[in-house]
C-alpha cells in the first residue's frame, strides 16, 4: 500500500509544501452503490479517518518516492446489512505541522471514487487508483462484526446456554437455527495438503513448506540432487509446484509469477486477484483507472472497458509502458507523460511520431507543377517555368537574368520566355552568330553556360533569394 506520484508523471514530489513537515490522513467514505459518484451525497454506509500516520519531512525540491501507508487499518463501521455493491471514496488529506505553518492546516491532496461489488467475509481486494499526479495503492474487504454472519452480514449467530449442533466455538444462526456461523476459512488457494489457518484469509504452512499458499517446499542441505524435504520428515521429494502451478487464475485467466507470488491476466468479464469475480455489469464499476464502461446492462451481457491512455487489460487494471511499443519512428526518443505520449525527433524528422522526413520527397508537394528531386541526403523542388522558391510558390521573372545573348531582347511569355535576336544572331537564346558566307553557325557563348535551361535558372534564382 502506498501513496505517491504515478509513473511517468515527472520527478516524484513530496506531499509537503515549503512550510515544513506534514502528515497524511486518509478519509474513507462508503456510499450506496446506487448513488451518483459525482454528487457530494452523505457517506450513508459509513465513514472513517485513518490514525497513527507517519510524519513526512521531505521538502518540495527533494525527490520523494511512493509513501508507505500506515500499518493500522482504516475500519469503517457500516450500518444495517452489507449491500454488496457500494461506492468507495478515499480522500488523501495533508496536515501541515510546525509552529510557522501559516495558512490552512488541512489540504485535500487527492480524491478517488469507484463503484465496487464485494461480499462480506471474502479475501482482500486490491486496487490502484490515480487522480491528477497522485497514485494510491490500497486493499479493502468487508467483514461482519459478531454476532452477524453471511455475505450480507444479515444473519445473526447468538450464543445460547444450551449446547448447539454446531460444535465447540461455533454458534447457531438466528432466525436460521439449522445453520451455523461460518468457520475460519483459509485464503483461497491455500494448499489443502500443506496449509492451514487460524484466522480468516490467512495461510500458515506446515513444516517443510513455504510460500504465500504453502506450495513451495523449504530447501535444506540434507536433500540432494535438487530434491526437497517432504512434510513431517517423510523424506526427500522432487521440488514442489511454483505459484502458477495448478493455475490459480480462474475463468480462463493466464498466470505469471511475480516475486514468489502470482499475477492473473483476466479475460473480459472477469476481474479480481484470481479472475474469480464475474457477472459484473457497468453498474458495478469494473473499469479501473478511469476506464469508461460500455455495455453490460445485465449480468448476461459482456461489458467493455475503454481504457485511458497508459492503461490496458480487460478492466484497465494494468499500466502499460506505451513507449515499449516503440511508437516513435526514425529513431525518435519516446516520452510517456502519463496523459500523453511525446516523441522527441532526430534532426531532419518531424511529426507527432517523427514520421515525416524533412529531407525526402515523401509527402512533400512542390506547387505549381513542380517536381521533387532527392539527392545527397536533401530534397529540392524543380519548378515549372515561371515559378521559383523552395516549394515553387513564387512567381518568377524569366527575363530577370537577361538570358538573351548578344543584345537580344527578352520577352516574358506564359510558357517561359522568348528572345528577339539582334541582327546577325540566332538561336533560342541568340547564342549563334550568323556567318554571311553561309558557313555553319558557331556558338558565341562559352560551353557550359546553358542559360537556356530555365530550370537551372530558376534553381539559381532560388538560391539567390535565400
Amino acid at each position: 500500500h502506498s501513496f505517491g506520484p504515478g509513473p511517468g508523471l515527472g520527478t516524484p514530489r513530496s506531499p509537503c509544501n515549503a512550510r515544513g513537515p506534514c502528515r497524511l490522513f486518509f478519509r474513507v467514505c462508503l456510499k450506496p452503490g446506487v448513488s451518483q459518484e459525482a454528487t457530494e451525497s452523505l457517506c450513508a454506509l459509513g465513514a472513517a479517518l485513518s490514525t497513527s500516520v507517519p510524519v513526512y519531512t521531505e521538502h518540495p525540491g527533494e525527490s520523494a518516492a511512493a509513501l508507505p501507508l500506515p500499518d493500522g487499518l482504516v475500519r469503517v463501521p457500516f450500518r444495517d446489512a452489507w449491500p454488496g455493491t457500494f461506492s468507495l471514496v478515499i480522500e488523501t488529506w495533508r496536515e501541515q505541522l510546525g509552529e510557522h505553518a501559516g495558512g490552512p492546516a488541512w489540504n485535500l491532496l487527492a480524491r478517488v471514487v469507484g463503484r465496487r461489488r464485494l461480499a462480506a467475509g471474502g479475501p482482500w481486494a486490491r486496487d490502484v487508483q490515480r487522480t491528477g499526479t497522485w497514485e494510491l495503492h490500497f486493499s479493502y474487504r468487508a467483514r461482519c462484526e459478531p454476532p452477524a454472519v453471511g455475505a450480507a452480514c444479515a444473519r445473526l449467530c447468538r450464543s445460547r446456554s444450551a449446547p448447539s449442533r454446531c460444535g465447540p466455538g461455533l454458534r447457531p444462526c438466528t432466525p436460521f437455527p439449522d445453520e451455523c456461523e461460518a468457520p475460519s476459512v483459509c485464503r483461497p488457494g491455500c494448499s489443502p495438503e500443506h496449509g492451514y489457518c487460524e484466522e480468516p484469509d490467512e495461510c500458515r504452512c506446515l513444516e517443510g513448506w513455504t510460500g504465500p499458499l504453502c506450495t513451495v517446499p523449504v530447501s535444506t542441505s540434507s536433500c540432494l540432487n535438487s530434491r526437497v524435504p517432504g512434510p513431517a520428515s517423510t523424506g526427500c521429494l522432487l521440488p514442489g509446484p511454483g505459484p502458477c502451478d495448478g493455475n490459480p487464475c480462474a475463468n480462463g485467466g493466464s498466470c505469471s509469477e511475480t516475486s514468489g507470488s502470482f499475477e492473473c491476466a483476466c479475460p473480459r468479464g472477469f476481474y479480481g486477484l484470481r479472475c474469480e469475480v464475474s457477472g459484473v455489469t457497468c453498474a458495478d464499476g469494473p473499469c479501473f483507472n478511469g476506464g469508461l464502461c460500455v455495455g453490460g446492462e445485465d449480468p448476461d451481457s459482456a461489458y467493455v472497458c475503454h481504457c485511458p491512455p497508459g492503461f490496458q487489460g480487460s478492466n484497465c487494471e494494468k499500466r502499460v509502458d506505451r513507449c515499449s511499443l516503440q511508437p516513435c519512428q526514425n529513431g525518435g526518443l519516446c516520452l510517456d507523460l502519463g496523459h500523453a505520449l511525446r516523441c522527441r525527433c532526430r534532426a531532419g524528422f518531424a511529426g507527432p511520431r517523427c514520421e515525416h522526413d524533412l529531407d525526402d520527397c515523401a509527402g512533400r508537394a512542390c506547387a505549381n507543377g513542380g517536381t521533387c528531386v532527392e539527392g545527397g541526403g536533401s530534397r529540392r523542388c524543380s519548378c515549372a517555368l515561371g515559378f521559383g522558391g523552395r516549394d515553387c510558390r513564387e512567381r518568377a521573372d524569366p527575363c530577370a537574368s537577361r538570358p538573351c545573348a548578344h543584345g537580344g531582347r527578352c520577352y516574358a511569355h506564359f510558357s517561359g520566355l522568348v528572345c528577339a535576336c539582334a541582327p546577325g544572331y540566332m538561336g533560342v537564346r541568340c547564342e549563334f552568330a550568323v556567318r554571311p558566307d553561309g558557313a555553319d553557325a558557331v556558338p558565341a557563348a562559352p560551353r557550359g553556360l546553358r542559360q537556356a535551361d530555365p530550370q537551372r535558372f530558376l534553381h539559381h534564382h532560388h538560391h539567390h533569394h535565400h
Epitope: 461480499a119 467475509g121 471474502g122 455475505a151 454446531c166 460444535g167 465447540p168 466455538g169 461455533l170 445453520e179 451455523c180 456461523e181 461460518a182 468457520p183 475460519s184 476459512v185 483459509c186 483461497p188 488457494g189 491455500c190 494448499s191 489443502p192 495438503e193 500443506h194 496449509g195 492451514y196 489457518c197 487460524e198 480468516p200 490467512e202 500458515r204 506446515l206 513444516e207 512434510p231 513431517a232 517423510t234 493455475n247 490459480p248 487464475c249 480462474a250 475463468n251 484470481r274 474469480e276
Partner: antibody, heavy 120, light 107 residues
C-alpha cells in the same frame, strides 16, 4: 509418504454401535493445524461427511448425525476412532478416513475405505 | 445447510472430447469449492480446490472455474482413465457437504 487405513467390523447388527479406527503414518496429530475426518458412501450413492478432529482436540460433527457420533484421537498411537451408535441398515456404506487441515476443510489424502454392512 | 446440485447426473462422451461438469450451490460459497474424482473400488481423489487450483499431481487437462453459486469442472480432452464419478464439495461453512455426483462414462 502419508498413508491412512481404516479398520473395524465388516458386519454389524441393527441397534448396535459401530467402532472404526483410522491408523495413519507420515504425519502426527500433535502438529498444529492437522486434523483427520470421516466420510461415508452408501453403495452407488454420494459422499457424506461425518466428523472431524484436530490437533487441539477440536471436534466437528455433521448436524444430522451429531447425536450418534463420537470422534476421539490417540495421538501417540497415530489413531483416530469414530463410534456410531444405533446402527441401521441405511448406515450400510464404505467408511473412509481422510486428512484435513484446520480452516482448509477439504480432504487431500484418503484411506482406501472399509465397507460396513448393517444387517440382522 | 448448503445443498450442492451437480449436473448432468450422467455424461456420455468419447475419449478426446471435452467434458463440462456443473455444480450449483443453494447459496454463495465464494470460491470455496473442490472437485474430487472417484473410480470404482477406489477412494476419492482431490482434483481441484478453491474453484480453480489444481491439486498436486493433477494433469493440466483438468481445470475449474466459477464463483458464488455456479461452478464448472472442465476436462479439455478426455483420456480413457478420466471416466469416473466426479463430486463437488464446499468449505464455505458448516456443515461441509458434497454434491450427489456426475458419472462420466464412455460413449
Amino acid at each position: 509418504q502419508i498413508t491412512l487405513k481404516e479398520s473395524g467390523p465388516t458386519l454389524v447388527k441393527p441397534t448396535q454401535t459401530l467402532t472404526l479406527t483410522c491408523t495413519f503414518s507420515g504425519f502426527s496429530l500433535s502438529t498444529r493445524g492437522v486434523g483427520v475426518g470421516w466420510i461415508r458412501q452408501p453403495p452407488g450413492k454420494a459422499l457424506e461427511w461425518l466428523a472431524l478432529i484436530y490437533w487441539n482436540d477440536d471436534k466437528r460433527y455433521s448436524p444430522s448425525l451429531q447425536t450418534r457420533l463420537t470422534i476421539t484421537k490417540d495421538t501417540p498411537k497415530n489413531q483416530v476412532v469414530l463410534t456410531m451408535t444405533n446402527m441401521d441398515p441405511v448406515d450400510t456404506a464404505t467408511y473412509y478416513c481422510a486428512r484435513s487441515n484446520w480452516g482448509n476443510w477439504y480432504f487431500a489424502l484418503w484411506g482406501r475405505g472399509t465397507l460396513v454392512t448393517v444387517s440382522s | 445447510e448448503i445443498v450442492l446440485t451437480q449436473s448432468p447426473a450422467t455424461l456420455s462422451l468419447s475419449p478426446g472430447e471435452r467434458a463440462t461438469l456443473s455444480c450449483r450451490a443453494s447459496q454463495s460459497v465464494s470460491s470455496y469449492l473442490a472437485w474430487y474424482q472417484q473410480k470404482p473400488g477406489q477412494a476419492p481423489r482431490l482434483l481441484i480446490y478453491d474453484a480453480f487450483y489444481r491439486a498436486t499431481g493433477i494433469p493440466a487437462r483438468f481445470s475449474g472455474s466459477g464463483s458464488g453459486t455456479d461452478f464448472t469442472l472442465t476436462i479439455s480432452s478426455l483420456e480413457p482413465e478420466d471416466f469416473a464419478v466426479y463430486y463437488c464439495q464446499h468449505r464455505s461453512n458448516w456443515p461441509i457437504t458434497f454434491g450427489q455426483g456426475t458419472r462420466l462414462e464412455i460413449k
